[in-house]
C-alpha cells in the first residue's frame, strides 16, 4: 500500500524533519506550511489549522518562502547618483546602480555606498584598463606610433596611418596628415572603444600613477607621495 | 587612541607644487577612506576630495581635478594629497580626515601659504 | 552637487539658554541604503573642526548630551539646549550622502 501523505498542519516522525516549503512551529509542535515568495504568515499554524498567508502590502517584499510575520521593507529610493535596475514587487527587492558614466568608489553590504564618475583619458592618453562597475579606468602615455584625440573613458590609444608622403607627422594626441590624397594603409578607420563597464570585483590591487581627467585621481603608491600627474585636466 | 598627524606648514611659490602628509595610527588604515578639506584665511570648510585607503578609489572636487592628486600608502599608514600649479588663493590650512560615512576624527591642519 | 543652507550665520546667544542652528539641502539626502548622512561639526577658533553628531541625531562618543541633532530628508536642526562658554565657534552642517560632499557655510555661535 502507498504510504499515507500527511497534511499541514502534522506531528511529525520523531527524529524527521518538516517537508521542502514546510517549517516546524514550535508552538504548535508541528510542521506547517511555509508562505511563498510575496506573501507572509498573517496567522501563524495552530494543532488544528495551517498557517494563514497574505500577499505584501506596497514597498514590501518577501523573496524566499517563509513564515515571517511581516513583509521586509523595500530600500530608499535610489540616490541621484544612481539608477534604479530591479524595481521593488513583492517579491524582490529594490537594486540601485551607479548610473551609466559612473563606478562604485566605495561598496557596502547593502550594494553602493558612493558612486563616483568614471575617469576621462585625455588627449595624449588612452585606456589602459577599463572601468568596472567598483573600479576606475586607468589611463597610459600613447607610445610612440600611437595617438589619442579625444578625452574618454573609453577610447584607448590608436596607430598613427602610414602616409606616401608625410605632411605632419603625428604625435601622441594627433594623427600623422598625409599629403598624398589617401595613405597607403590606414590603421585607424575610427575611434576604438572599450565596453562600457561589466559586473566584476575589484580587487585590491596598487596601479601605477596615470594621467586623467576625472574627478578621481587616485593612485596607490609603495613608497611616499606620487609626482605630478602630467596632462591631467578638468572636463 | 585614533590619530591624525599632519606634515608641517609650507611656503610656496606662485605655480609650485605642494604636498601635505597625513599619518594614521590607533585604527586599521585600510578600512577607512580619508577625506581633504581646507579651509581658506576666514572662511568656511571646502571639500576637496576623498579616498579609499583600501582600493585607491578617489574622487576630488570638480573645480580641483586637473590640479589635485590623493594617494594613500598603506605600508606605512600615510594618505598624502599633491596640489600642483598653486595660486595665491591656495592659501589655507589643509585638512585631512578619517571616513566616508562621517568624519570622526581630524588631523591638526597643515597652513599652506602661495606668495611670491 | 548638493548645496546646504545653513541659517542663521551668525548667533548670538545668552549663556545658559538654547540654541538652534538650522541646516537645509538642495535635495534629499536619504541614501538607498536607508541612512541619512548628515553630520554637524563644531568648529572652536583655531582648533580642526570636531564631530558632533552623525547620521542625523547620533552624538559622537564624548560629546556632552546637551547637543542634539534632528531632521529629516532635506531639513536638519542643531540644538543647544543649554549654552556653554565652550561652545563658542563655528558650526558647520556637512552630507557625505553622494559626491561632491559638501558643507554649509557655517553659523557663528556667540556669546551676547
Known amino acids: 500500500l502507498p504510504a499515507q501523505v500527511a497534511f499541514t498542519p502534522y506531528a511529525p516522525e520523531p527524529g524527521s524533519t518538516c517537508r521542502l516549503r514546510e517549517y516546524y512551529d514550535q508552538t504548535a509542535q508541528m510542521c506547517c506550511s511555509k508562505c511563498s515568495p510575496g506573501q507572509h504568515a498573517k496567522v501563524f499554524c495552530t494543532k488544528t489549522s495551517d498557517t494563514v498567508c497574505d500577499s505584501c502590502e506596497d514597498s514590501t517584499y518577501t523573496q524566499l518562502w517563509n513564515w515571517v510575520p511581516e513583509c521586509l521593507s523595500c530600500g530608499s529610493r535610489c540616490s541621484s547618483d544612481q539608477v534604479e535596475t530591479q524595481a521593488c514587487t513583492r517579491e524582490q527587492n529594490r537594486i540601485c546602480t551607479c548610473r551609466p558614466g559612473w563606478y562604485c568608489a566605495l561598496s557596502k553590504q547593502e550594494g553602493c555606498r558612493l558612486c563616483a564618475p568614471l575617469r576621462k583619458c585625455r588627449p595624449g592618453f588612452g585606456v589602459a584598463r577599463p572601468g568596472t562597475e567598483t573600479s576606475d579606468v586607468v589611463c597610459k602615455p600613447c607610445a610612440p606610433g600611437t595617438f589619442s584625440n579625444t578625452t574618454s573613458s573609453t577610447d584607448i590609444c590608436r596607430p598613427h596611418q602610414i602616409c606616401n608622403v608625410v605632411a605632419i607627422p603625428g604625435n601622441a594626441s594627433m594623427d600623422a596628415v598625409c599629403t598624398s590624397t589617401s595613405p597607403t594603409r590606414s590603421m585607424a578607420p575610427g575611434a576604438v572603444h572599450l565596453p562600457q563597464p561589466v559586473s566584476t570585483r575589484s580587487q585590491h590591487t596598487q596601479p601605477t600613477p596615470e594621467p586623467s581627467t576625472a574627478p578621481s585621481t587616485s593612485f596607490l603608491l609603495p613608497m611616499g607621495p606620487s609626482p605630478p600627474a602630467e596632462g591631467s585636466t578638468g572636463d | 587612541q585614533v590619530q591624525l598627524v599632519q606634515s608641517g606648514a609650507e611656503v610656496k611659490k606662485p605655480g609650485a607644487s605642494v604636498t601635505v602628509s597625513c599619518k594614521a595610527s590607533?585604527?586599521?588604515?585600510?578600512?577607512?577612506?580619508i577625506i581633504w578639506v581646507r579651509q581658506a584665511p576666514g572662511q568656511g570648510l571646502e571639500w576637496m576630495g576623498w579616498?579609499?585607503?583600501?582600493?585607491?578609489?578617489?574622487n576630488s572636487a570638480q573645480k580641483l581635478q586637473d590640479r589635485v592628486t590623493m594617494t594613500t600608502d598603506t605600508s606605512t599608514s600615510t594618505a598624502y594629497m599633491e596640489l600642483r600649479s598653486l595660486r595665491s588663493d591656495d592659501t589655507a590650512v589643509y585638512y585631512c580626515?578619517?571616513?566616508?560615512?562621517?568624519?570622526?576624527?581630524w588631523g591638526q591642519g597643515t597652513l599652506v601659504t602661495v606668495s611670491s | 552637487d548638493i548645496v546646504m543652507t545653513q541659517t542663521p550665520l551668525s548667533s548670538p546667544v545668552t549663556l545658559g539658554q538654547p540654541a538652534s542652528i538650522s541646516c537645509r539641502s538642495s535635495q534629499s539626502l536619504v541614501h538607498s541604503d536607508g541612512n541619512t548622512y548628515l553630520s554637524w561639526l563644531q568648529q572652536r577658533p583655531g582648533q580642526p573642526p570636531r564631530l558632533l553628531i552623525y547620521?542625523?541625531?547620533s552624538r559622537f562618543s564624548g560629546v556632552p548630551d546637551r547637543f542634539s541633532g534632528s531632521g529629516a530628508g532635506t531639513d536638519f536642526t542643531l540644538k543647544i539646549s543649554r549654552v556653554e562658554a565652550e561652545d563658542v565657534g563655528v558650526y558647520y552642517c556637512t552630507q557625505s550622502t553622494q559626491f561632491p560632499f559638501t558643507f554649509g557655510r557655517g553659523t557663528k555661535l556667540e556669546i551676547k
Open positions: 547620521k542625523v541625531s
Open positions: 580626515a578619517r571616513g566616508e560615512d562621517f568624519f570622526d576624527y
Open positions: 590607533g585604527y586599521t588604515f585600510s578600512t577607512y577612506g
Open positions: 579616498i579609499s585607503a583600501f582600493n585607491s578609489n578617489a
